[in-house]
């Protein structure tokens, strides 16, 4: 999957939602490379080069990519629940200038849900679609044990018990 | 396959209860089972959904939330709880599944069922 | 509730002619939209869903076009068969999420 340019676009607050969401203005810039894949499942619109992600009232985009940061708070999984029920996963994050999108719009200090958990199967941090972290590019903050799961504060990943109510970000 | 049962003839201000009944799969899994009526002679109307995982969230039509109750009641078993039915509330009632992939779509509708007021 | 508007509400057509429907959200839902056919005493069929994605079975003649709030369906190549009323359908993926549908567009067939 190519990371496209994309340009980035404001998402006014929608009647349904006390969510407000704010525009980027796009100084963050992609290198040309190549993104984990993520599995089809995840994949919401149709992604061909001549197609342009186009993200709903609501929703902010950023690389081909469409975000929203929720203003109540839940636990990871009714977080989890959330986002699928809006055909969306909690939040991938691919790299450190993702990461700055996230924080720049979070405008709050607070812990942030992330679609990242310790699953006690793989004995391993794994994002939503299956993946693994890549340790080179993200430090987990906290122990790796059962009932742990990710929320992000200053750009920094900590972990957490999963039961606990943070805010959360979904993605598709 | 899907079928819709429970439609009859009903007095205005009365009450009914529709069910939508699953064959070859269970709701449970990650998309909606949902209710859409149809007036004799004219368009489809979005009333709502209700999602088959675990959360068994609801969402209604602005028109519909109050009088109009969507449930998951068994494993393949969801109904539709109607109160205070005017003549407007004439019409074929359908459920329908939408695809548990990552499109919005209603890939599965049952036959229909009259509701007359 | 996001509310869709379809034009026109009915379309007259020759065999072998093409028909555009226009249906237009009130706010941006994407792409994500579907189309569907229904004919008199039979259940909605899709046609088309992820706003230009054809659904398996549905011949290429249908083509979906569009995002944000404006979408369009072509028939192309009519057919005797194709004579029914067309549906668009917005999906909202909002805090309450919402599926309306478009008033309806019927394509007559001459």
């Known amino acids: 999957l190519l990371v496209s340019q994309g340009v980035l676009l404001k998402c006014q607050k929608g009647s349904c939602s006390n969510a407000t969401q704010y525009e980027d203005t796009g100084d963050l810039k992609v290198n040309n490379g190549t993104r984990r894949n993520i599995s089809n499942k995840d994949l919401c619109a149709s992604r061909s080069a001549d197609q342009t992600v186009l993200c709903q009232s609501e929703w902010l985009k950023y690389q081909g990519k469409c975000y929203w940061f929720s203003n109540e708070m839940k636990s990871w999984s009714d977080s989890y629940v959330y986002c699928l029920e809006r055909k969306s996963h909690l939040l991938i994050i691919h790299d450190q200038l993702e990461m700055a999108f996230i924080q720049k719009n979070l405008r709050q200090l607070n812990y942030v849900w992330i679609g990242l958990n310790f699953t006690s199967l793989k004995m391993t941090w794994t994002w939503v679609d299956g993946s693994p972290i890549d340790s080179k590019i993200f430090f987990i903050k906290g122990p790796a044990k059962e009932n742990s799961c990710a929320a992000i504060k200053e750009s920094k990943i900590f972990s957490e018990t999963c039961s606990s109510v943070f805010k959360w970000i979904c993605q598709y | 396959s899907l079928e819709e049962y429970g439609g009859d003839v009903v007095q205005p201000e009365g009450s009914l209860t529709l069910t939508c009944t699953a064959s070859?799969?269970?709701?449970?899994?990650?998309?909606?089972i949902c209710w859409v009526r149809q007036a004799p002679g004219k368009g489809l109307e979005w009333i709502g959904c209700?999602?088959?995982?675990?959360?068994?969230?609801t969402c209604y039509a602005t028109w519909a939330k109050g009088r109009f109750t969507i449930s998951k009641t068994l494993s393949t078993t969801v109904t539709l709880q109607m109160t205070s039915l005017t003549a407007t509330d004439t019409a074929t009632y359908f459920c329908?599944?939408?695809?548990?992939?990552?499109?919005?779509?209603?890939?599965?509708w049952g036959p229909g069922t009259l509701v007359t007021v | 509730d996001i509310v869709m508007t379809q034009t026109p509400a009915s379309v007259e057509a020759a065999v072998g002619g093409t028909v555009t429907i226009k249906c237009q959200a009130s706010?941006?839902?994407?792409?994500?939209l579907a189309w569907y056919q229904q004919k008199p005493g039979q259940p909605p069929k899709l046609l088309i869903y992820?706003?230009?994605i054809l659904e398996s079975g549905v011949p290429s003649r249908f083509k979906g076009n569009g995002s944000g709030t404006q979408f369009t369906l072509t028939i192309s190549d009519l057919e005797c068969a194709d004579a029914a009323t067309y549906y668009c359908?917005?999906?909202?993926?909002?805090?309450?999420?919402?599926?309306?549908f478009g008033g309806g567009t019927e394509v007559v067939v001459k």
């Open positions: 070859g799969f269970s709701f449970s899994g990650n998309y909606w």
């Open positions: 992820g706003a230009s």
């Open positions: 706010q941006s839902i994407g792409r994500d």
């Open positions: 359908q917005g999906a909202d993926r909002s805090s309450t999420p919402s599926w309306p």
């Open positions: 329908a599944r939408d695809t548990g992939s990552g499109y919005w779509k209603y890939n599965i």
């Open positions: 209700i999602y088959a995982g675990s959360s068994g969230s």
